[in-house]
């Protein structure tokens, strides 16, 4: 007969390491009598028999994890006690391993030339993997531009045209490496001019060809403005080679002009875009003018339309950068000016800031601008916009203004030429004189000059006449 | 001496059953892990099933599993393999052994002379 | 399930000569290995259990060794009666899986 022994663990349990989804055992060799009763804890709570996760074999001193799980980490201790003396109990720790996952992996990036791009890639595993980049077909250097993030991810600042290419990430610890698919960083580069196109002075129907290269990620395409719009004549020929973009105008002169190139190209929503101008003068009419350097064409613009003559010509002033546009700007400006004035006032100001800004023009060999005539320009200033103009008397700025704040266009009166001394100098105003008939009520202004100067104003309804010397200022 | 004696091997047609038995003498049967292992003609040693001491715990290969059923009587000091539908590749010489616990795992110290099934039609 | 994988798979040796085999679990396996010889027409016996203990009465030209997942069984100086089929086998698994054996001829 068998003396009574108390349980002795044999064999102390030990670190046990383990892959997830891999078998983990542990061992409790138990020495005793009667035989013992063993039962098992991890982190102190015990594991119940019945769970299909754990094998417990040899009387319980052999625990199995069928298929491991993160979650399995912890202390696992065996208890072994028969009633003899104490229980006894050995512990040992289950390390999880994970071989290196890539949970976010990088994407294909397209970022702008100069910015900074962030490709992605979170890792799992334990040991913790260090991560890697590879470039191409070779191992990525850090810089100090580029650099792999504690996360794993590559960060490139000031990104450039060189570091487009393809990219994977590489996770590694001591049980395996991962490696995330190819992406592809794309590199876009904003339109640039490389040439732009060169100023000509020709004689009047010369042919001119202006050149334009430009140079972008993805590759620009170029249009061509004339004085501010889309160009009406000419051919253009157009070559791409090596994201290089190269656009010929050939133009038949018959009148100067300013000639923009615009490079544009995509990114995403956005434009990129890069202009460059070149002037195209006649040389006769840059010798024979020196003050008036313009040209005569159709009004192409909006706010105008309805106040200047039916295909008219009118005068441009090339010491505008880009005389239509400026010009077109200026009296839009104008006209949000104009919205404060009083409805008598107003349709005669827009027809004097039209004039004046598009003054109707003789083509002949020198464009010549013709101002408006005196006489029209002081019934508006007198008649039509009496009060306006006495509102702002004293004021230091030239110019109709809405609440003393806004400057207007406004020609100088006194210096425009009479419609008396030569009819053909000046421009006539139709609306004014069709206008003036019906106006009944005028604002008492004293004038030293009788009202013959505004031309068919009846005497008996107008009491200001008109002073020559009166100024706009 | 301890020994380990098969019987009820022999021929059987595929979807058949046969019932192996495994006596056991010179131990103490009731205190030990029993397994059964088995040979294909000129093949290596394939694991088939296992049984605890007191038959609280029960393992099968994954190529038995559902047609197999292993079992024990400690009073009789016997281990046994009932087998159902048989197929071909059950063809083999069937040993029972006694699993030894160690200092590392179990391993079988001792093992009968083997019992030979075939199964042919 | 653990596979073990054996190599090689057969061997040609002379007496006197010292071989090794080896064995690789597909996953740890601790020191939870066994290695059997088997000659033909007789039942598998234990040479040694936990990867290094020489189980009693097996001569001690055989040795084991190993931890994890790589293990190998030295015979020193072959002998007449060391020609035979080897296996290894572990029990970390309560699904118990043997190597494919390694299968030790006369030179």
């Known amino acids: 007969e068998k003396l009574p022994k108390a349980p002795v663990i044999t064999t102390p349990l030990e670190t046990v390491d383990a892959l997830v989804e891999e078998v983990a055992t542990f061992m409790c060799a138990v020495e005793s009598y009667p035989q013992p009763e063993i039962s098992w804890t991890r982190n102190k709570i015990l594991i119940k028999l019945f769970d299909t996760r754990y094998s417990i074999r040899e009387n319980g001193q052999l625990l199995t994890i069928l298929s491991v799980e993160d979650s399995d980490d912890g202390i696992y201790c065996c208890i072994a006690n028969n009633g003899v003396g104490g229980a006894v109990e050995s512990c040992g720790a289950l390390q999880v391993k994970m071989k290196p996952k890539i949970t976010r992996p990088p994407i294909n990036v397209k970022i702008i030339e100069g910015l900074k791009a962030v490709l992605p890639c979170t890792t799992m595993g334990n040991p913790k993997p260090s991560v890697s980049w590879i470039k191409g077909d070779n191992a990525l250097r850090e810089n100090s531009r580029i650099a792999v993030l504690e996360s794993g991810s590559l960060r490139i600042h000031n990104v450039q045209k060189e570091d487009a290419g393809q990219y994977r990430c590489v996770a590694k610890n001591s049980l395996g490496t991962a490696y995330s698919k190819l992406v592809k960083l794309e590199v876009e580069v904003f339109a640039r001019i490389l040439r732009a196109p060169e100023s000509h002075n020709v004689t009047f129907g010369s042919f001119v060809t202006l050149r334009c290269t430009a140079i972008g990620i993805p590759v620009p395409t170029i249009s061509w403005i004339e004085n501010g719009n889309a160009v009406s004549s000419g051919s253009i020929q157009e070559s791409v080679k090596d994201r290089v973009i190269d656009s010929r105008l050939q133009l038949f002169i018959t009148k100067p002009g300013l000639y923009t190139c615009i490079a544009t190209n995509k990114h995403g929503e956005k434009f990129s875009t890069a202009k460059a101008a070149a002037t195209v003068s006649i040389a006769e009419w840059s010798k024979s003018q020196k003050d008036s350097q313009g040209y005569c064409a159709q009004y192409r613009g909006e706010v105008c339309d309805a106040v200047l003559a039916k295909d008219a010509l009118v005068f441009f002033n090339t010491s505008y950068r880009d005389p239509e546009d400026a010009q077109e700007l200026l009296i839009h400006t104008a006209w949000n000016e104009l919205k404060a004035v009083s409805p008598l006032c107003r349709p005669a100001a827009e027809a004097l800031l039209c004039n004046h800004l598009f003054q109707e023009c003789s083509p002949g060999v020198v464009p010549t601008p013709m101002p408006i005539c005196r006489e029209y320009c002081l019934a508006v200033k007198e008649l039509f916009c009496a009060k306006e103009w006495q509102a702002m008397e004293g004021k230091a700025h030239r110019g109709l203004y809405r609440s003393g704040m806004h400057l207007l266009p406004v020609p100088e009166c006194s210096k425009l030429p009479s419609m008396h001394r030569d009819p053909t100098a000046c421009t006539r105003l139709p609306y004014l004189d069709y206008k003036k008939e019906n106006i009944t009520t005028f604002p008492s202004i004293t004038s030293s000059r009788p009202s013959a100067d505004i031309p068919n104003l009846p005497a008996s309804t107008s009491s200001f006449a008109v002073s020559p010397a009166y100024s706009m200022t | 001496e301890v020994q380990l004696v098969e019987s009820g091997g022999g021929l059987v047609k595929p979807g058949g059953s046969l019932r192996l038995s495994c006596a056991a003498s010179?131990?103490?049967?009731?205190?030990?892990?029993m397994d059964w292992v088995r040979q294909a003609p000129g093949k290596g040693l394939e694991w088939v099933s296992s049984?605890?001491?007191?038959?609280?715990?029960?393992y099968y290969a994954d190529s038995v599993r559902g047609r197999f059923t292993i079992s024990r009587d400690n009073a009789k000091n016997s281990l046994y393999l009932q087998m159902n539908s048989l197929r071909a590749e059950d063809t083999a010489v069937y040993y029972c052994?006694?699993?030894?616990?160690?200092?590392?795992?179990?391993?079988?110290?001792?093992w009968g002379q083997g019992t030979l099934v075939t199964v042919s039609s | 399930d653990i596979q073990m994988t054996q190599s090689p798979s057969s061997l040609s040796a002379s007496v006197g000569d010292r071989v090794t085999i080896t064995c690789r679990a597909s996953?740890?396996?601790?020191?939870?290995v066994n290695w059997y010889q088997q000659k033909p027409g007789k039942a598998p016996k234990l040479l040694i259990y936990?990867?290094?203990t020489l189980q009693s009465g097996v001569p001690s030209r055989f040795s084991g060794s190993g931890s994890g997942t790589d293990f190998t069984l030295t015979i020193s100086s072959l002998q007449p009666e060391d020609f035979a089929t080897y296996y290894c086998?572990?029990?970390?698994?309560?699904?118990?899986?043997f190597g494919q054996g390694t299968k030790l001829e006369i030179k």
């Open positions: 052994a006694r699993g030894q616990l160690a200092v590392a795992g179990t391993h079988f110290d001792y």
């Open positions: 010179g131990f103490t049967f009731s205190s030990y892990t």
């Open positions: 049984i605890g001491s007191n038959g609280d715990y029960i």
């Open positions: 996953q740890k396996v601790n020191k939870y």
């Open positions: 936990a990867a290094s």
């Open positions: 086998q572990q029990s970390y698994s309560p699904l118990s899986t």
